[in-house]
Amino acid sequence: HSDGIFTDSYSRYRKQMAVKKYLAAVLGKRYKQRVKNK
């Protein structure tokens, strides 16, 4: 555990947030498409 705390960095957090945002946008788009196709 020599450097255990440093894995929770702001840069990693920002990347995670960007991925979440992208996935939400993609899933939202798919959902809208499905509704439109019904």
């Epitope: 020599s2 255990g4 705390i5 894995t7 960095s9 702001y10």
Partner: antibody, heavy 112, light 110 residues
Framework: SVEESGGRLVTPGTPLTLTCTVS????????MSWVRQAPGKGLEWIGI??????TYYASWAKARFTISKTSSTTVDLKMTSPTTEDTATYFC?????????WGPGTLVTVSS | DPVLTQTPSSVSAAVGGTVTINCQSS????????LSWYQQKPGQSPKFLIY???NLASGVPSRFKGSGSGTQFTLTISDLECDDGATYYC??????????FGGGTEVVVK
């Protein structure tokens, strides 16, 4: 987000436990620090718990505070035997050595 | 424990001016860059400004600039605005998983 609770007026020597509740992320992937600020003074780092539950403390805080994870969303700070010098606002903050999400703080007053 | 020394303890400058705050560490920070800066106004929580010595946090204006590595760091605020009046703190992360804060610098904008 992060929110602290449990701050109140206590008499010297009475143990007190503060709780930090997080939302929007899990403690299984976060390091959480406790930081305090005495009235009119600067910020003082107390200690940290990493994503695996390992704890690290400032040398002055080792015998006086205990940090523990009590659930996937809560971290406690136990003040074992508070003195009047421990009167401060206690903050919980996320991040390993760079504190990027802060709570509003909870005020602890130690007085007889 | 490592000690972070901030200078000056207080600085005053006019709107539109520039202030420089220094932060010296008694030992090298983790990876020579694990130094962050915070802004705190009375009655509020600290606000995260700069991470890993020189990177701006989201939403922080480019008027804020961090520099340095190892044991010597600087925060420069240019084109000062009234809203920049606050106390600024540096914080370091170190090998062995310990952290520390500087003593703070009060910035007064005239």
């Amino acid at each position: 987000s992060v929110e602290e609770s449990g701050g109140r007026l206590v008499t010297p020597g009475t143990p007190l436990t503060l709780t930090c509740t997080v939302s929007g992320f899990s403690l299984s992937s976060a390091a959480m620090s406790w930081v305090r600020q005495a009235p009119g003074k600067g910020l003082e780092w107390i200690g940290i718990i990493d994503d695996s539950g390992n704890t690290y403390y400032a040398s002055w805080a080792k015998a006086r505070f205990t940090i523990s994870k009590t659930s996937s969303t809560t971290v406690d700070l136990k003040m074992t035997s508070p003195t009047t010098e421990d009167t401060a606002t206690y903050f919980c903050a996320r991040g390993g050595g760079e504190f990027f999400i802060w709570g509003p703080g909870t005020l602890v007053t130690v007085s007889s | 424990d490592p000690v972070l020394t901030q200078t000056p303890s207080s600085v005053s400058a006019a709107v539109g001016g520039t202030v420089t705050i220094n932060c010296q560490s008694s030992q090298s920070v983790y990876n020579n860059k694990w130094l962050s800066w915070y802004q705190q106004k009375p009655g509020q929580s600290p606000k995260f400004l700069i991470y890993q010595a020189s990177n701006l946090a989201s939403g922080v204006p480019s008027r804020f600039k961090g520099s340095g590595s190892g044991t010597q760091f600087t925060l420069t605020i240019s084109d000062l605005e009234c809203d920049d009046g606050a106390t600024y703190y540096c914080a370091g992360g170190y090998r062995g998983n310990v952290c520390g804060f500087g003593g703070g610098t009060e910035v007064v904008v005239k």
